[in-house]
């Protein structure tokens, strides 16, 4: 169809805050459990801990983590999951500061991916009870779709 | 021409990942070779240690570099080499712990920037024989054309 | 109106750098003061610590600082002001080591966020007297108009 | 405190070669560069490059490649500057200055007291 | 290359007498310019970096300011110990460069 000049900018967009994050007894990991602040159309959907890709293509995808722990290095590791396997697709590391009055930083990437319907993205501490800092301003998630 | 739904998204867009670091002898920097990970449309081209530009315009860069190093702050340096002269587009910077252990930091920046034909754009760590990580999801680079 | 080819790519942009920071005495922040490296489109205008918004719309936006200083942690904070009231986007936060010659770390932090006509853009340091680098390719502050 | 001491003044024909040798103490030698800066008689001063000595990697000035070669001993606390195919416009100062070790985006604070070199036949 | 442009290349005044001289980079070096002091048959002396940090011992007379592309070092009153040559440099950028030098003399 012949675009508007309305249609032409409308990139789907979505920027979603944290709920809370938690830790499996049984797993080294913390997970965080997402909500949108933003969402400009229909082909993503939070859902828990994962987002589902519900219109494949190529997203720019972007994570910040506010970590508040004096374990020696932290980071987040954002996934995809779908068609029977896992793909780590980029990852933050940050050393920290072994005093816990310094240990405060925000570990910030980003990156261009061919996200697949049905796919779950997700963001994984690889830490268990990781101390994160759960401000919709120091951690966040966001999917712009190019 | 009356442009599609279809036609209307494709930005073009190039993920690259490493595929080795060097060192020049005669000069304090370490480069990064790369290989495409993700390529949309022909305006770019990774061609050995930089990448160059086909098609002229504006375009988000970015870059991040996964250090493993004790030299007390290491990071990345984004260039364009074009007409003639060197221009630094954005850098990166990381104080590193000085334990071997801790020392493991991601350092990740980006920005907009009018790039023209013939460009070669580069990522160089102002240090030989830098300590990085070239793991695709720690080490990567990228451009969407805008 | 029918797209042609070279219209449907023109998202508005503006990638700014600094011109100098400044403390009011009476506050504890740092202000930066920008000026355009790059432009396209009108719907943003540089107007000395703050960017207006002069086109509403969803945006990405992104800010790095170079901090050269001692002070446990530092970091910077994007904000909107308008229809009244003040409201926080994003934020980085860096630990800084304690030895000034270590004290070196860029802080890069983005998202995508909605912003609305007369909106007030700006970005501050929660420190008086911040000891920046205002090199343009460290320290600068980046919109574009999805 | 920190010093840089650099060796004596020479006197060399127009063609030879001269090193010259800037031995560092009061600081750790390894965590910072060391530049080297040039300045003719009655001129300004100019950039040469530096020697890290962390991994004893040169960085040149381009207008000095082929003409300086800047090398550093660790276990001496040295670094060194050798001039080959020298001419009478070469004929300066020549100091040494500490620099932090990510060259870019610090100052030179401490100097050498510099070193003569006259090219003369 | 950057080219950093010194203003005035010669300045007489006298013991308390407030100087100004000025740097201009041909492109934004944003605050990555010193200042150095040179007498005759000595070594410079880092007296301001990052455009207006002064360098430990440095008296209080001596400020610097600036950004981007022009550039500052200001005496606020001239001693006898002052009356030397004064360098800017820029170290944004490779390769680094100086300015061609201010001599100050007694008038």
């Known amino acids: 169809a012949v675009l508007t000049q309305k249609q032409k900018k409308q990139h789907s967009v979505l920027h979603l805050v944290p709920i809370n994050a938690t830790s499996k007894d049984d797993s080294d990991v913390t997970e965080v459990m997402w909500q949108p602040a933003l969402r400009r159309g229909r082909g993503l959907q939070a859902q828990g801990y994962g987002v589902r890709i519900q219109d494949a293509g190529v997203y720019l995808l972007y994570s910040q983590v506010l970590f508040q722990d004096v374990t020696f290095t932290m980071g987040q590791v954002v996934s995809r999951e779908g068609q029977g396997r896992q793909e780590t697709l980029f990852r933050c590391i940050r050393s920290m500061p072994s005093h816990p009055d310094r240990a405060y930083n925000s570990c910030y990437s980003a990156g261009v991916f061919h996200l697949h319907q049905g796919d779950i993205l997700s963001v994984i501490i690889p830490r268990a009870r990781a101390k994160l800092n759960l401000s919709p301003h120091g951690t966040f998630l966001g999917f712009v779709k190019l | 021409a009356v442009l599609t739904q279809k036609q209307k998204k494709q930005h073009s867009v190039l993920h690259l990942v490493p595929i080795n670091a060097t060192s020049k002898d005669d000069s304090d920097v370490t480069e990064v070779m790369w290989q495409p990970a993700l390529r949309r449309g022909r305006g770019l081209q990774a061609q050995g240690y930089g990448v160059r530009i086909q098609d002229a315009g504006v375009y988000l860069l970015y870059s991040q570099v996964l250090f493993q190093d004790v030299t007390f702050t290491m990071g990345q340096v984004v260039s364009r080499e074009g007409q003639g002269r060197q221009e630094t587009l954005f850098r990166c910077i990381r104080s590193m712990p000085s334990h071997p252990d801790r020392a493991y930091n991601s350092c990740y920046s980006a920005g907009v920037f009018h790039l023209h034909q013939g460009d070669i754009l580069s990522v160089i760590i102002p240090r030989a024989r830098a300590k990085l990580n070239l793991s695709p999801h720690g080490t990567f680079l990228g451009f969407v054309k805008l | 109106a029918v797209l042609t080819q070279k219209q449907k790519k023109q998202h508005s942009v503006l990638h700014l750098v600094p011109i100098n920071a400044t403390s009011k005495d009476d506050s504890d922040v740092t202000e930066v003061m920008w000026q355009p490296a790059l432009r396209r489109g009108r719907g943003l205008q540089a107007q000395g610590y703050g960017v207006r918004i002069q086109d509403a719309g969803v945006y990405l936006l992104y800010s790095q600082v170079l901090f050269q200083d001692v002070t446990f942690t530092m970091g910077q904070v994007v904000s909107r002001e308008g229809q009244g009231r003040q409201e926080t986007l994003f934020r980085c936060i860096r630990s800084m080591p304690s030895h000034p010659d270590r004290a070196y770390n860029s802080c890069y932090s983005a998202g995508v966020f909605h912003l609305h006509q007369g909106d007030i853009l700006s970005v501050i340091i929660p420190r008086a007297r911040a000891k920046l680098n205002l090199s343009p390719h460290g320290t600068f502050l980046g919109f574009v108009k999805l | 405190q920190v010093q840089l001491v650099q060796s004596g003044a020479e006197v060399k024909k127009p063609g030879a070669s001269v090193k010259v040798s800037c031995k560092a103490s009061?600081?750790?030698?390894?965590?910072?560069?060391m530049h080297w800066v040039r300045q003719a008689p009655g001129q300004g001063l100019e950039w040469m490059g530096y020697i890290n000595p962390y991994n004893d990697a040169p960085k040149y000035n381009e207008k000095f490649k082929g003409k300086a070669t800047m090398t550093s001993d660790t276990s001496a606390s040295t670094a060194y500057m050798e001039l080959s195919s020298l001419r009478s416009d070469d004929t300066a100062v020549y100091y040494c200055?500490?620099?932090?070790?990510?060259?870019?985006?610090?100052?030179?604070?401490?100097w050498g007291q510099g070193t003569t070199v006259t090219v003369s036949s | 290359d950057i080219v950093m442009t010194q203003s005035p290349s010669t300045l007489s005044a006298s013991v308390g007498d407030r100087v100004t001289i000025t740097c201009k980079a041909s492109?934004?070096?944003?605050?990555?310019v010193a200042w150095y002091q040179q007498k005759p048959g000595k070594a410079p002396k880092l007296l301001i970096s990052?455009?207006?940090n002064r360098d430990s011992g440095v008296p209080s007379r001596f400020s610097g300011s600036g950004s981007g592309t022009e550039f500052t070092l200001t005496i606020s009153s001239l001693q006898p110990d002052d009356f030397a040559t004064y360098f800017c440099q820029q170290y944004n950028i490779y390769p680094f460069t100086f300015g061609q030098g201010t001599k100050l003399e007694i008038k």
């Open positions: 009061g600081y750790t030698f390894t965590s910072y560069v």
């Open positions: 990052s455009a207006s």
């Open positions: 492109q934004n070096v944003g605050n990555n």
């Open positions: 200055a500490r620099g932090l070790g990510y060259a870019l985006y610090y100052a030179m604070d401490y």
